[in-house]
């Protein structure tokens, strides 16, 4: 494919006109989300709000400048950022002795890029250097893709409900997606 997405810490992220990029889950005020009918977006309809811990797989639009060293694109490009979780928790608490273990109640999915598109951008460089053309690879759509324990050894998926057994030396995930008894979650749509 050979496309390179130029992006560094200096990249300027500009919310697209009419778009309101939501903060990452840990920054979200989890009392502002609502029921499934509103798909996890800020409530524009009078549905009952709920405390939530998870969010649907969303395509957030961002407009940014492409940078490469000292050079910057003449115009900003608009791309998608895949954000959120896919569906309800699929880790369940499993108390064994004094410790708390997590075991899966279904496969784990992650919100990741699905398709990409190529866009040619013109980079302007300081000091009178000639503009350079670059092709950048931008996310075009997102999907909820299956994640296995082999992809990430920190995923606690080494035992299932039909073969539950404690794993020595394992710790539960930080901010695990476990389902706590009275913890409501966002109803997602894929």
């Amino acid at each position: 494919q050979g496309w390179q997405a130029f992006k560094n810490d200096a990249t300027e992220i500009i919310p697209e006109l009419g778009e309101y990029p939501e903060p990452p889950p840990e920054l979200e005020n989890n009392k502002t989300m609502n029921r499934a009918e509103n798909g996890g977006r800020p409530p524009h309809h009078p549905f009952e709000t709920k405390d939530v811990s998870e969010y649907s797989c969303r395509e957030l639009h961002f407009t940014r400048y492409v940078t490469d060293g000292q050079c910057r694109s003449a115009k900003p490009v608009t791309e998608l950022v895949c954000s959120g979780q896919c569906g309800p928790a699929r880790l369940l608490p499993n108390a064994i002795g004094r410790g708390k273990w997590w075991r899966p109640s279904g496969p784990d999915f992650r919100c990741i890029p699905d398709r990409y598109r190529a866009q040619r951008v013109q980079l302007l460089c300081p000091g009178g250097a000639a503009p350079r053309a670059r092709k950048v690879r931008l996310v075009a759509s997102c999907k909820c893709k299956r994640l296995t324990r082999f992809h990430n050894q920190s995923e606690l998926k080494d035992f299932g409900p039909e073969a539950a057994r404690p794993q020595k030396g394992r710790k539960p995930r930080p901010r695990a997606r476990g389902a706590k008894a009275n913890q409501a979650e966002l109803e997602n749509a894929y």
Epitope: A36, V52, S53, E54, C57, C86, G87, P88, A89, R90, L92, P93, P104, S105, G106, P107, F109, K143, C144, K145, R146, T148, R149, F150, K157, D158, F159, G160, P161, E162, A163, A179, K180, A181, Q183, A184, E185, L186, E187, N188, Y190
Partner: antibody, heavy 123, light 107 residues
């Protein structure tokens, strides 16, 4: 024996709602998410969504978003699927289903199915 | 959504025949492919999961193969109880999707 027993057939008018129940037995209800799958007459299978019985969190197929609500009652080990604003093309058999797991292959599959609930939408 | 295309949609065969059903995914689904058998008026029953793993209790005449986008269910010697409709299902990407089904009829 693991079993999922569903409520009886329903006949509804267009625009109405239907609520199908699925009572689980033979396993710990809160150990597995419950899924719902439907099948229109002479057609294939269509996954509608799933719910986590512990938290009440649900995930739905985008096709049904806004019309479907899945809930559970852990005290009776029962899952419910409500479909609103019914149309004639919602006429189908609705199944609840529970996943099974193979920890060697880290894979999941629809292992246990309810007997199905026929919902007919007709004016 | 990932489209699952089964072929043929129906076939006629005799007891003892070798039957092959194919399932093609619109994008790579690794080995997350399951096969189900359904008889009229009944719920589907799992036969094979993870492309080729036979569920306990399923006769060994059923086998599955493939990876990526192309998968096959084979019945090595068709038995009277095998006349049914067969569905493939992908578990790689949400929403889960099923093939349109292949009806195996008596010739």
């Amino acid at each position: 024996e693991v079993q999922l027993v569903q409520s009886g057939a329903e006949v509804k008018k267009p625009g109405a709602s239907v609520k199908v129940s699925c009572k689980a037995s033979g396993y710990t209800f809160t150990d597995y998410n419950m899924h719902w799958v439907r099948q229109a007459p002479g057609q294939g299978l269509e996954w509608m969504g799933e719910i986590n019985p512990n938290s009440g969190g649900a995930g739905y197929n985008q096709k049904f978003k806004g019309r479907v609500t899945m809930t559970t009652d852990t005290s009776t080990s029962t899952a419910y699927m409500e479909l609103r604003s019914l149309r004639s093309d919602d006429t189908a058999v609705y199944y609840c289903a529970r996943l099974g797991y193979d920890d060697i292959y880290d894979d999941w599959y629809f292992h246990v199915w309810g007997q199905g609930t026929t919902v007919t939408v007709s004016s | 959504d990932i489209q699952m295309t089964q072929s043929p949609s129906s076939l006629s065969a005799s007891v003892g025949d070798r039957v092959t059903i194919t399932c093609r995914a619109s994008q790579d689904i690794s080995n997350y492919l399951n096969w189900y058998q359904q008889k009229p008026g009944k719920a589907p029953k799992l036969l094979i999961y993870h492309t080729s793993r036979l569920l306990s209790g399923v006769p060994s005449r059923f086998s599955g193969s493939g990876s990526g986008t192309d998968f096959t269910l084979t019945i090595s010697s068709l038995q009277p109880e095998d006349f049914a409709t067969y569905y493939c299902q992908q578990g790689d990407t949400l929403p889960y999707t099923f093939g349109g089904g292949t009806k195996v009829e008596i010739k």
